[in-house]
Interface confidence: low
Amino acid sequence: IWELKKDVYVVELDWYPDAPGEMVVLTCDTPEEDGITWTLDQSSEVLGSGKTLTIQVKEFGDAGQYTCHKGGEVLSHSLLLLHKKEDGIWSTDILKDQKEPKNKTFLRCEAKNYSGRFTCWWLTTISTDLTFSVKSSRGSSDPQGVTCGAATLSAERVRGDNKEYEYSVECQEDSACPAAEESLPIEVMVDAVHKLKYENYTSSFFIRDIIKPDPPKNLQLKPLKNSRQVEVSWEYPDTWSTPHSYFSLTFCVQVQGKSKREKKDRVFTDKTSATVICRKNASISVRAQDRYYSSSWSEWASVPCS
Amino acid sequence: RAVPGGSSPAWTQCQQLSQKLCTLAWSAHPLVGHMDLREEGDEETTNDVPHIQCGDGCDPQGLRDNSQFCLQRIHQGLIFYEKLLGSDIFTGEPSLLPDSPVGQLHASLLGLSQLLQPEGHHWETQQIPSLSPSQPWQRLLLRFKILRSLQAFVAVAARVFAHGAATLSP
């Protein structure tokens, strides 16, 4: 048993059928010595008396808010949550496996630049009685600070018969060094509590591996005289690290016909302009990627040829 | 322009060669995300590599003040990786395919290090750790880890030279 936060405790249970569970001793936070009784949740049934209560925690029916009273007055509370381990593996029932980039990916994170700011998100089908708290650090043995905000519900989607809820959190490395080569990964830890079930999820990454620039901005076409060619120009996204002479991007320019089956013409360039042939009903799209490190491409920025 | 403590490198040449190094490092190990190497207990193998750290002056401001600190650190790293790529880790079994980019990568590391340190000019180099994996699969894993680490190193080096070519060239 360990303390998650004040008056909230997590009991770790090997979840085998009829496992005897864990013996837990609760102590009433009071100078009083006698006349103390204990109840669980909203029930008025007295579970025991005295300053301490010894319980055998086996299953969710044994978890909950234990309260000690004296003469009708509440003295203190202890909330017991369960963390289940089945077949030697901690349960992962609360979050959905996103399966990208590999199985057992519960947390996904992205950064728009090298400033040390990143966003993580996760999915669940649970709509109520759900809380998350997020902690992060750079490295684990001698951790350096990363500050995370509160996790918020960022999207709701319908998937077949189920509703899926996306939660996200923003974190910022306290003393980020954008130009340095990372040697210690960022660690992100999410505590999830659903009703009386506790679970924790972790992710470990380098900022350089989760970089995904925003799409290029101000995408414009300039027709070239007496030609089907156009000059496409764009700018670095505002959110990208500066100076651009140091934090450089490379770009992919694509000409795509109306039909998905039509051949796509692609040009790669380090410049912020390119000359392409604009076909009728086609569109021109540009996306960006770090020039020197192959992390994710941005989403496409697009304009119609007409 | 001249920089305190040494002459200015051929920024444009260094830029071109470092960008080529980036391309080669990724073609030698494109499996980004397919193998999470941090799960494979790599502490004893790749945390001895020289990293370009915050105090090494490789940021835009540090380069403007005195690029020599940063260039020395990059040179150390290039020599270190050049030795690793020429070691038993890459030459031993399982042998690399004949058209593997590792050979080119090795030569380019040497080329860039020579651009940074002409004959008769000596910077301290870092000792290469004695890594002698006994099993072919361990060697394979070590190669992946070294290449992943090299990708991060040459990305920073390429940024330095790109910025230098754009702002510090005579």
Epitope: D14, E59, F60, G61 | -
Partner: antibody
Framework: EFQLVQSGAEVKKPGASVKVSCKAS????????MNWVRQAPGQRLEWMGV????????TYNQKFKGRVTITVDTSASTAYMELSSLRSEDTAVYYC???????WGQGTLVTVSS | DIVMTQTPLSLPVTPGEPASISCRSS???????????LNWFLQKPGQSPQLLIY???TRASGVPDRFSGSGSGTDLTLKISRVEAEDVGVYYC?????????FGSGTKLEIK
């Protein structure tokens, strides 16, 4: 008082499917996994699979290779076991048993016969 | 899968006499938490199985103290100190150390 009440006996033709229900009462249905066990005439008990009613997650005995599906309707506190592609050797009494195997349903006889 | 081998197949006993049923597991049921994940059941004629012993030696609620369980990780025993007429039926051991859970073939206890 804890109780598991199963649906009545079924007679099925080979190749058909059967769906047996198990209604729970006297406890919080979502707190406990539900197991399904069967017993062919004169044979040992055979565990088929288990479901976590809170999340719908299942673990099956690979012997039944995709033929068994365990589901729950939490609003009705009921677990279901469906067995498809029935053959004569599936003739058995099918039991639901709450986590810990301390509480069992009364059993449902499924007869597979042409 | 873990194979549970039960002996004897049939056990005729005189009321008041002790009885012992053995169960051997193909793999240790002693888990790293120090617990042995074995259940014993009694199935009386025409009834569902009832849990007698869990975790090798803990009696389920309402089970008389004449029933006891013991053993190592692989060799397990159910003992009845003094058999009574109501104890007739088929006794099964079951491992719940890993999926799929498996049962022994059963021991039929009869009154002589």
């Amino acid at each position: 008082e804890f109780q598991l009440v199963q649906s009545g006996a079924e007679v099925k033709k080979p190749g058909a499917s059967v769906k047996v229900s198990c209604k729970a009462s006297g406890y919080t249905f979502t707190d406990h996994n539900m197991n399904w066990v069967r017993q062919a005439p004169g044979q040992r008990l055979e565990w088929m699979g288990v479901i976590n009613p809170n999340y719908g997650t299942t673990t099956y005995n690979q012997k039944f290779k995709g033929r068994v599906t365990i589901t729950v309707d939490t609003s009705a506190s009921t677990a279901y076991m469906e067995l498809s592609s029935l053959r004569s050797e599936d003739t058995a009494v099918y039991y639901c048993a709450r986590r810990g195997f301390a509480y069992w349903g009364q059993g449902t006889l499924v007869t597979v016969s042409s | 899968d873990i194979v549970m081998t039960q002996t004897p197949l049939s056990l005729p006993v005189t009321p008041g006499e002790p009885a012992s049923i053995s169960c051997r597991s193909s793999k240790s049921l002693l888990y790293k938490d120090g617990k042995t994940y074995l259940n014993w059941f009694l199935q009386k004629p025409g009834q569902s199985p009832q849990l007698l012993i869990y975790l090798m030696q803990t009696r389920a609620s309402g089970v008389p103290d004449r029933f006891s369980g013991s053993g190592s990780g692989t060799d397990l025993t159910l003992k009845i100190s003094r058999v009574e007429a109501e104890d007739v039926g088929v006794y099964y051991c079951q491992q719940i150390a890993e999926y799929p859970f498996t049962f022994g073939s059963g021991t039929k206890l009869e009154i002589k």
